[in-house]
């Protein structure tokens, strides 16, 4: 807390500029008008204030806006955002994607902080759902964002948002998350033709049921082994040898290298030896 002292003669700030870096903390408190600071927030980032000086500027804004900062100020916080606590951020009403981007930029390259997480939560709740543009932005800054959400949270993602998802965004998703995302992806990509559809749906197939895998096996998709190994075991088990052969195409030879790992191991044990022998891979059921 900075003590209240009168501003020395001739030191009253007329604008936010570089001369302020030479002000002591108490001089900033006494000589910088909070309303002036709020209207010229965009200048603060161009000035090399110390952390202590930034604390004073934050204190002035807190006094001016005890109920939370307006978006016109939030958008231009820049590095001052790093001084905000989650409690501060919970008071904000952030509706503009540009504001969100500006603040995510400040934290770029770092792990998601509690401040950023709170900001994102406020933003998404304000919008009512995780729409495509928001998801696009969040996954650009935090590729693991989608897989950090619970299945319950993912259920509120509209199918249209799935277009923003890249394969790497799903790398750390667990089966229960893919169970929720797969039907949305199927709906989102339903009007694409066979080969294009497979390219888009491939990353989501860890949530696919048996009947959809059977349907894909009729379409010459040539699924790679990495994708096959991520399929749900319960979805793979009912597939016949012929269906797996069609599903994998030329990649079927890769089953030999994976014969001790799930779901391949469990699938092999379910097949008749005669059928396995037709593959010519030496798989033992």
């Amino acid at each position: 807390e900075v003590e209240k002292t009168a501003c020395p003669s001739g030191k009253k700030a007329r604008e936010i500029d570089e001369s302020l870096i030479f002000y002591k903390k108490w001089e900033l408190e006494a000589c910088v008008d909070a309303a002036l600071l709020a209207t010229q927030m965009d200048r603060v980032n161009a000035i090399p204030f110390t952390y202590e000086q930034l604390d004073v500027l934050k204190h002035k804004l807190d006094e001016l806006y005890p109920q939370g900062y307006p978006e016109s100020v939030i958008q231009h916080l820049g590095y001052l955002f790093l001084k905000m606590s989650p409690e501060d951020i919970r008071k904000w009403n952030v509706t503009s994607l540009e504001t969100l981007k500006a603040l995510l930029e400040v934290n770029k390259g770092h792990e998601m902080s509690p401040q950023v997480a709170t900001l994102i939560d406020r933003f998404v709740k304000g919008r009512g759902q995780l729409d495509k543009d928001t998801l696009d932005t969040l996954t650009a800054f935090y590729p693991g964002y989608l897989c950090s959400l619970s299945p319950e949270e993912l259920s509120s993602v509209p199918p249209s948002s799935i277009w923003a998802v890249r394969p790497q965004d799903l790398d750390t998703c667990d089966p229960r998350q893919l169970d929720v995302l797969y039907p949305k992806a199927r709906l989102a990509f339903q009007n694409m033709n066979g080969s294009e559809y497979f390219v888009k749906i491939q990353s989501f197939l860890g949530g696919a049921p048996t009947e959809d895998l059977k349907a894909l096996s009729q379409q010459n998709v040539s699924m790679d082994l990495a994708t096959f190994m991520k399929l749900r075991t319960d979805a793979v088990l009912p597939l016949t040898v012929a269906e797996v052969q069609k599903l994998l195409g030329p990649h079927v030879e890769g089953l030999k290298a994976e014969e001790r790992h799930r779901p391949v191991r469990d699938w092999i044990l379910r097949q008749r030896q005669d059928d396995l022998d037709t593959l010519g891979l030496g798989l033992q059921g």
Partner: nanobody
């Protein structure tokens, strides 16, 4: 091993407030959840508030929405439940719960670790 200890329960008049706190130790998962459940006598254990431990998203039961607020305090390593405008029907034993490694705190069966509980009694 995750260890959860609740505190802050007690008796309060309807319309009053309480703040429950759950001290968390041994929780290292960056992907997971913390929740507050409650159980009234003769009723099923129900989840009232959820917080995603990585992205701090929150979910509330319809019956407590806009009255309860769950938050994580990194410095103290606690997960708190601020309960405002309490009603007699909020009377229950309140439990802190943690989920990780594919557990998402959606149901009581979907929890990895439980606290011992703290009693909240709201009288009219």
């Amino acid at each position: 091993q995750v260890h959860l200890v609740e505190s802050g329960g007690g008796s309060v008049q309807a319309g009053g407030s309480l703040r429950l706190s759950c001290a968390v130790s041994g929780y290292t998962s960056s992907r997971g959840c913390m929740s507050w459940f409650r159980q009234a006598p003769g009723k099923e254990r129900e989840r009232v508030a959820y917080i995603n431990m990585r992205v701090l998203t929150t979910i509330y039961a319809a019956s407590v929405k806009d009255r309860f607020a769950i938050s994580r305090d990194n410095a103290k390593n606690t997960v708190d439940l601020q309960m405002n405008n309490l009603k007699p029907e909020d009377t229950a034993m309140y439990y802190c719960a943690a989920g990780y490694n594919g557990q998402w705190c959606e149901h009581a069966s979907d929890v990895t670790a439980w606290g011992q509980g703290t009693q909240v009694t709201v009288s009219s």
